[in-house]
Every structure is written in structure tokens, then in C-alpha cells.
């Protein structure tokens, strides 16, 4: 807490300018009017204050706006945003995407801090849903943002926003998240033709059910092994050897290198060895000839 001291004669700040660099902390406290600071916040970032001086300026704003800063001040916080606590940010009502961008810019290049997470949460809740422009902005600054949301939060993403998603934005998503995103992507891209559709849907296929994979196998899509390895195991298991061959096209040869890894390993265990041999890849572990395969999952469902 800075002591209340009178401002020395002739030092009262008439505007926020670089002469304030030379003020001691107590002089800033005594000589800078909080209302003046609030109206000229855009100038603060152009002036190389010390972090200690910025603490004084924050204190002045806190006194002026105990219920939370107005958006006109928030948009120009700059370095001062780094001084804010999540508790400070929870008092804010941020509605402008420009304000959000300005503050994300301040944190650019850093991991998502608790302050930024709180800011985004406030912003998205204020908007009611994660619209395309917001998603565009957030994934530009934080490619992993989408995968940091819970499946429940992802359910509020409208299909139209899916157009803003880039493949790298989904790199860290787990199957539960892709289960929510895949149907939205399918809906968003439904009017595209075969090859264009596959390019767009490919990153989301970790949430695709068996029937959709079967349909894709009829479209000469040539899925690469990296995508195939990210598919849900339960969606891959029912696929026949012929369907996997069509789905992968020339990439089918890559199965040999992945035969010990899921989902390939589990899929091999479900195929007849005869059928696997038709691929000519030397895949081993299929069901020997003459064995009967019982689908116990159906029996369990009936009982």
C-alpha cells in the first residue's frame, strides 16, 4: 500500500506522458489523477514504466473502479494486464472481440495463463456460445485451445464455427472431445464433394463411427496411416479387410509397421488370417482358418 502524500508543487500530471517515467512511486500515487489515467490508458504502453510504477497505476485504477474496469480501460491495459489476477478479471464484462484480441496480444508467445483462461471464460460466457470469429481468434493465439475445453463446453460450439478449426488445433484432443466435434464437422461440411469433404473432415475422424468409415472406404479417399491410427478402436474393429484396404488405398502397406499398436493390433485379432494374407503384407495374429467367431457383445446386449 502506497502512503498518501501530497503532490509536490508543479508535479501534478496534466496528461499521461513520458515525463512520468521520472516520477518516484509515491509521486505517481500523489500526482496522477485516476480519472485522467483511465481516459488516457492508450498512452501507458508507449511509455517504459518499471513494473513497480505499473503496480501504482493499477492501484489507482482499482480505487477508481472497485466493481471492475469498464471495457474502454480494459482494451488498453497492455502491460497492466500482466498485473491482473483472475479475481480482478472476474469483475469485468468483456464483450468486444477487439478487446479480447488486444489482451491476448499482450500474452502472445506464452502458455495460457490463469488470467487469460479467466478472460476467455468471461468472454465466451458473455457471448453465450463459441462463435466462429471468437474461435478463429482463440485458436490463432492458442492452437490447443479447443482441446482444453470439456466435452460439455464443446457442445456449445455451433457447427458453423467448425470452419475456423485447423488440423493443428485438434492435435491434443482426446476421443471424448472428438466424439462431440465430429458430428458438428460432418454437418458443417455436408455440402462438399467427396475429395474436398475428406480433406476437411480428416482431422475430426477420431470421433467417427464405423458406418461413416465404411462409407468413406467407398470413396477412394486414401487415408494416411497417421489418421487411421487416431481412429476409435471400437469404430475400426468391425471393418473388413477389404474395407480397410479401400480406406487406406496405397497407404495400406503402412499397416505392417503398426501391427503391434492400437487400433491395428486389435483389428488384426478380429480378422480371418486368410483375409489378412490377401494383403500380402505378412500381417500375423488373425483368426486361424476353421475357427468360428462368436459376437458375444450381441449376446450380452440381448440378455
Amino acid at each position: 500500500e502506497v502512503e498518501k502524500t501530497a503532490c509536490p508543487s508543479g508535479k501534478k500530471a496534466r496528461e499521461i506522458d513520458e515525463s512520468l517515467i521520472f516520477y518516484k512511486k509515491w509521486e505517481l500515487e500523489a500526482c496522477v489523477d485516476a480519472a485522467l489515467l483511465a481516459t488516457q490508458m492508450d498512452r501507458v504502453n508507449a511509455i517504459p514504466f518499471t513494473y513497480e510504477q505499473l503496480d501504482v497505476l493499477k492501484h489507482k485504477l482499482d480505487e477508481l473502479y472497485p466493481q471492475g474496469y469498464p471495457e474502454s480501460v480494459i482494451q488498453h491495459l497492455g502491460y497492466l494486464f500482466l498485473k491482473m489476477s483472475p479475481e480482478d478479471i472476474r469483475k469485468w464484462n468483456v464483450t468486444s472481440l477487439e478487446t479480447l484480441k488486444a489482451l491476448l496480444e499482450v500474452n502472445k508467445g506464452h502458455e495460457m495463463s490463469p488470467q487469460v483462461a479467466t478472460l476467455i471464460d468471461r468472454f465466451v460466457k458473455g457471448r453465450g456460445q463459441l462463435d466462429k470469429d471468437t474461435l478463429d481468434t482463440l485458436t490463432a493465439f492458442y492452437p490447443g485451445y479447443l482441446c482444453s475445453l470439456s466435452p460439455e463446453e464443446l457442445s456449445s460450439v455451433p457447427p458453423s464455427s467448425i470452419w475456423a478449426v485447423r488440423p493443428q488445433d485438434l492435435d491434443t484432443c482426446d476421443p471424448r472431445q472428438l466424439d462431440v466435434l465430429y458430428p458438428k464437422a460432418r454437418l458443417a461440411f455436408q455440402n462438399m464433394n467427396g475429395s474436398e469433404y475428406f480433406v476437411k473432415i480428416q482431422s475430426f475422424l477420431g470421433g467417427a463411427p464405423t458406418e461413416d468409415l465404411k462409407a468413406l472406404s467407398q470413396q477412394n479417399v486414401s487415408m494416411d496411416l497417421a489418421t487411421f491410427m487416431k481412429l476409435r478402436t471400437d469404430a475400426v474393429l468391425p471393418l473388413t479387410v477389404a474395407e480397410v484396404q479401400k480406406l487406406l488405398g496405397p497407404h495400406v502397406e503402412g499397416l505392417k509397421a503398426e501391427e503391434r499398436h492400437r487400433p491395428v493390433r486389435d483389428w488384426i485379432l478380429r480378422q480371418r488370417q486368410d483375409d489378412l494374407d490377401t494383403l500380402g503384407l505378412g500381417l500375423q495374429g488373425g483368426i486361424p482358418n476353421g475357427y468360428l467367431v462368436l459376437d458375444l457383445s450381441m449376446q450380452e446386449a440381448l440378455s
Epitope: E18, S19, P48, Q53, G78, Y79
Partner: antibody, heavy 125, light 108 residues
């Protein structure tokens, strides 16, 4: 042309003080801040502080606070840097530099567009 | 204070080649308050770039700066013999101003 000319090399003993001068010419001396930067052997550049010649306001890096004093004499367009209680760690080349006037509206710039030639200071017993 | 890290420490290239020098800040630098200087032994440093991307007066257009936040780059599109030197970045957004340790560009 615009230039800053510094005083010559100095050899000092530990505990002594040092005062280097930096004379500006070819521009209005009081319109531009003067900064001081040093470079120890094999090290990077280290900012020491600013002075505004028109009113004598100073701003020092915390590392040098209390040990450095920046002054100017506007009648001779000269800036001075005094460093006290010298140790061998103060062996360095000291530069004065003019703050660039590359400002647009309230977007100030504090890069240094004209530099002195440097003054070599050796502190040794 | 804001700490600047430069990489690589040394860049060995031939005249005519492209040089890409990196400067990373420990805290974001608001309003791109970052400058680049060229420094040759026995000479005064020379300002190349200010505001992260604006060339200083008289600086050839083979020098360009880019970046924002914490990551900044100086690019020399085609190295001339006189470009072999040490390059420093400097932030002037927060006091105290700080410099990076420098990148030495030498002839391969």
C-alpha cells in the same frame, strides 16, 4: 553531421570514481535524451540510464542506482556520466547514445540512433 | 526485468546467403518496443531497426525485422561483406531497458 564525441580512455584503481564526457554536435542538444550503455569484455550491452538535457531528469537502471550520476551542461552540449566506488567488474567500454526521435503521436521510441565512439575504462590495482 | 535471449550464438554464412536471427523475450513486449543494432569491434553500435520492423534512416532494405509478443526476428536477405558483425536486440517497453547477449554473424 550529427555526432557524439566521448572523452579518452581511462585507467582507474578500485574504489576510485570515474567521469566521462560526451559532447553532441550537429543537432539541438536539449531536444534529445542521452542514454549511457556499457559493454564489459566478452559481454553484451548493458543499459545504465537516461538523462533529459532540457530539465536534467534522470532515470537509472536499478543495478547502478546510487552509484551513477548523469548530468549535462547545455551551454557546451555535453553530457557526463560519473560512476563511483569502482571495482574490476566496471572494466568496460562505455558508450553515450542519443535517443531516437522516431515518434508517431504518443507511440514513443527509446531506441538509440546515434552513438559515441566509446570510452575504454580499465579498473585495476 | 525483461530478459532477452538471442539465437543462435554464432551464425557462419557466406556472402550472398540469407541470415535469420532470433530474439526471444521472457515477457511479452507490448507495442513492439524492440530494436536491433549492429556492432563491429572498435566501433559504435549502429541502429538498424526500431519498433520491431521499422528500418532506421539510411539502413539498406536487405535488413528487415518482424515479430511481436515474445518472438522477434531480424533477417538479412543477402549478406554483404560489411554485414559480418555482432547483432543485438534491445527492448524498451519496460524499464530497465535490456539487451540480448548478441548473435555473431561470421564468414564461413
Amino acid at each position: 553531421q550529427v555526432q557524439l564525441v566521448q572523452s579518452g580512455a581511462e585507467v582507474k584503481k578500485p574504489g576510485e570514481s570515474l567521469k566521462i564526457s560526451c559532447q553532441g554536435s550537429g543537432y539541438s542538444f536539449t531536444d534529445y535524451w542521452i542514454g549511457w550503455v556499457r559493454q564489459a569484455p566478452g559481454q553484451g550491452l548493458e543499459w545504465m540510464g537516461w538523462i533529459t538535457p532540457n530539465n536534467g531528469n534522470t532515470n537509472y537502471a536499478p543495478k547502478f542506482q546510487g552509484r551513477v550520476t548523469l548530468t549535462t551542461d547545455t551551454s557546451t552540449s555535453t553530457a557526463y556520466m560519473e560512476l563511483r566506488s569502482l571495482t574490476s567488474d566496471d572494466t568496460a567500454v562505455y558508450f553515450c547514445a542519443r535517443r531516437g526521435r522516431n515518434s508517431s503521436g504518443y507511440l514513443y521510441y527509446y531506441s538509440m540512433d546515434v552513438w559515441g565512439q566509446g570510452t575504454t575504462v580499465t579498473v585495476s590495482s | 526485468e525483461i530478459v532477452l535471449t538471442q539465437s543462435p550464438g554464432t551464425l557462419s554464412l557466406s556472402p550472398g546467403e540469407r541470415a535469420t536471427l532470433s530474439c526471444r523475450a521472457s515477457q511479452p513486449i507490448v507495442a513492439s518496443h524492440l530494436a536491433w543494432y549492429q556492432h563491429k569491434p572498435g566501433q559504435a553500435p549502429r541502429l538498424l531497426i526500431y519498433g520491431a520492423s521499422t528500418r532506421a534512416a539510411g539502413i539498406p532494405d536487405r535488413f528487415s525485422g518482424s515479430g511481436s509478443g515474445t518472438d522477434f526476428t531480424l533477417t538479412i536477405s543477402r549478406l554483404e561483406p560489411e554485414d559480418f558483425a555482432v547483432y543485438f536486440c534491445q527492448q524498451y517497453g519496460i524499464s530497465p531497458f535490456t539487451f540480448g547477449p548478441g548473435t555473431k554473424v561470421d564468414i564461413k
